[in-house]
Interface confidence: medium
Amino acid sequence: HGTELPSPPSVWFEAEFFHHILHWTPIPNQSESTCYEVALLRYGIESWNSISNCSQTLSYDLTAVTLDLYHSNGYRARVRAVDGSRHSNWTVTNTRFSVDEVTLTVGSVNLEIHNGFILGKIQLPRPKMAPANDTYESIFSHFREYEIAIRKVPGNFTFTHKKVKHENFSLLTSGEVGEFCVQVKPSVASRSNKGMWSKEECISLTRQYFTVTN
């Protein structure tokens, strides 16, 4: 009775910096006892490694077993349904999971006001799982860029975008007062990685922040 169960329809990675999650879609009409077996293959070592025999969720955190992702040729994963003694055929990820598949994020954005300028500092992600030498800036050591979106509340404009090539930026507010909300989306000019907009950070600018100069 080896392959009576249907296979998971699709299997894919969703990854951020040192947060590598494998996802799959459930088989149709799964029972309460259906679970999923996960295996991993590292390119260059052509054998599948069993990671989980029976996961009842539809995702699995593979970060701990893919810590060398940023120094390797990448991985493939496969998942099959298991129900008692029955199991399905494997469904394999249809693309190689490599550093190119990692969605870029920032850790946070810090804002302060000085002399009518909004000064922003982009904090890079510092995931707990990352080995000490594998910082964002060491892995993506060149061509880091950030798109900045600023919204003024209340105001007559929604966004202003700027590509900056470093982790600090400044915006001359030209006497505008109100609440300014900032989002940042990272990219690396030499790479094709997608970037994710950060959580919005806001700061209020009132007349007290403007200095009079003669």
Epitope: T160, H161, K162, F169, S170, L171, L172, T173, S174, E176
Partner: nanobody, 127 residues
């Protein structure tokens, strides 16, 4: 002196698209932040969008809601405004304008920051 000449306006149905162009002559176009304002019948001039000299920063009025894109081609001394999903309330005369200064600043949201203006092109959105 910088001369600006808009084109591309016309009659379009709601939900349709138009691409406005603004051709510049005279002074060096590439050193200016340039933008679009509009004036609906019986209303004041309203900021639409602007783009810095090198194209790395764009500004949009809040009514744009992602429907418009602004771009420029410095080799052709031309500014563009691609307008999609047009609505009746987008009916207006659209003006091209150029400002001096290159700092990343909210001054470009203000009419008073723009020293050079075109004559305008009429966009009518109606079924």
């Amino acid at each position: 002196e910088l001369q600006l000449l808009e084109s591309g306006g016309g009659l379009v149905q709601p939900g349709g698209s138009l691409r406005l162009s603004c051709a510049a002559s005279g002074r060096t176009f590439s050193s200016h932040t340039v933008g679009w304002f509009r004036q609906a019948p019986g209303k004041g001039r309203e900021f639409v969008s602007a783009i810095t000299w090198n194209g790395d920063t764009t500004y949009f009025g809040d009514f744009v809601e992602g429907r418009f894109t602004i771009s420029r081609d410095n080799s052709k001394n031309t500014l563009y405004l691609q307008m999609n999903s047009l609505r009746a309330e987008d009916t207006a005369v659209y003006y091209c304008a150029a400002a001096t200064g290159q700092v990343w600043s909210l001054q470009y949201l203000r009419e008073s920051s723009y020293a050079y203006w075109g004559q305008g092109t009429l966009v009518t959105v109606s079924s």
